[in-house]
């Protein structure tokens, strides 16, 4: 599947997941904490201040690194899955902290967490960027 299609599909699913999570957690615009978000790469569930959210590497990296195998499971499509099954020491896991000032940046950054073969990528001339 082309990356544009993957992103549009994942973004739509993300917004649905966030809405369901907001209802489950009783979140609204005035709630303290961090709203769920689609960062143009992957989906982040709403979180309370002090909470660390872990996600598996997004689908994009299966295009970038078709041979890459991660030990972690992919987060379920119907909801946000169980973050407790993920561990930051695993390859293929990215985290964000919810602070009083909002979300931190991903840790590690996506390339460091998900792997990126810079030299392999230069063999093809395909464009993997997408329309936001």
């Amino acid at each position: 599947m082309h990356s544009d299609c993957i992103f549009k599909k994942e973004q739509a699913m993300c917004l649905e997941k966030i809405q369901r999570a907001n209802e489950l957690m009783g979140f609204n615009d005035s709630s303290p904490g961090c709203p769920g978000m689609w960062d143009n790469i992957t989906c982040w569930k709403p979180a309370h201040v002090g909470e660390m959210v872990l996600v598996s590497c997004p689908e994009l990296f299966r295009i970038f690194n078709p041979d890459q195998v991660w030990e972690t499971e992919t987060i379920g499509e119907s909801d946000f899955g169980d973050s407790n099954s993920l561990d930051l020491s695993d390859m293929g896991v990215v985290s964000r902290n919810c602070t009083e000032d909002g979300w931190s940046e991903p840790f590690p950054h996506y390339f460091d967490a998900c792997g990126f073969d810079e030299y392999e990528s230069e063999t093809g001339d395909q464009d993997y960027y997408y329309l936001s």
């Epitope: 143009n40 931190s104 950054h109 990126f116 960027y129």
Partner: antibody
């Protein structure tokens, strides 16, 4: 090897505009975030802006927000910085740097810089 | 924004000596703290990523430690080419920031 070459610097009067360019080669430009970082003469480094691999995410330092615009043309392997309403305190050597990430990342390779002097 | 403070501002040492540079963040940056070296007339060079991760091509005498708000860059035995300015940089929260730098000069 990764190469970043900045251009477009020069002497400009306060209030005027300038556009910097950064030509990238030696890596798949369209897959990496890119940064602008500046350094005033004899001073330290100041982070200016970052743009994600496709241009969908752009972030700025407070000191330049609303005046500077970061953009990229992946078909030309070129990064840009449009600088409007320039001030004397914008005088600096402007570096473009590759971000080791798709979204933001930390700068891992740097160009040699282009000097911007804002003076009347 | 997160403010990074580096100390000392200047470190005067002789070749062969050990250099210990400090970087303190105004709030936690986890391990998203990176170190750069800059020599006069040159662009900065990435030395250490994520507080302590070494990079290929960087001599083993450079090492980093710390997490949260306190970080250290150590040069185990100074070589003549190590006299330069060292900057820490946080990529934990936007806007990203650099420390003011520590100049390591020859005593």
């Amino acid at each position: 090897q990764v190469q970043l070459v900045e251009s477009g610097g020069g002497v400009v009067q306060p209030g005027r505009s300038l556009r910097l360019s950064c030509a990238a080669s030696g890596f798949t430009f369209s897959r990496f975030a890119m940064h602008w970082v500046r350094q005033a003469p004899g001073k330290g480094l100041e982070w200016v802006a970052v743009i994600s691999f496709d241009g969908g995410n752009k972030y700025y330092a407070e000191s330049v927000k609303g005046r500077f615009t970061i953009s990229r043309d992946n078909s030309k392997n070129t990064l840009y910085l449009q600088m409007n309403s320039l001030r004397a305190e914008d005088t600096a050597l402007f570096y473009c740097a590759r971000g080791y990430d798709i979204l933001t990342g930390y700068p891992d390779y740097w160009g040699q810089g282009t000097l911007v002097t804002v003076s009347s | 924004e997160i403010v990074l403070t580096q100390s000392p501002a200047t470190l005067s040492l002789s070749p062969g000596e050990r250099a210990t540079l400090s970087c303190r963040a105004s709030q936690s940056v986890g391990r998203s703290l990176h170190w750069y070296q800059q020599k006069p007339g040159q662009a900065p060079r990435l030395l250490i990523k994520y507080a302590s991760q070494s990079l290929s091509g960087i001599p083993a005498r450079f090492s980093g430690s710390g997490s949260g708000t306190d970080f250290t860059l150590t040069i185990s035995s100074l070589e003549p080419e190590d006299f330069a300015v060292y900057y820490c940089h946080q990529s934990s929260r936007l806007p990203f920031t650099f420390g003011p730098g520590t100049k390591v000069d020859i005593k």
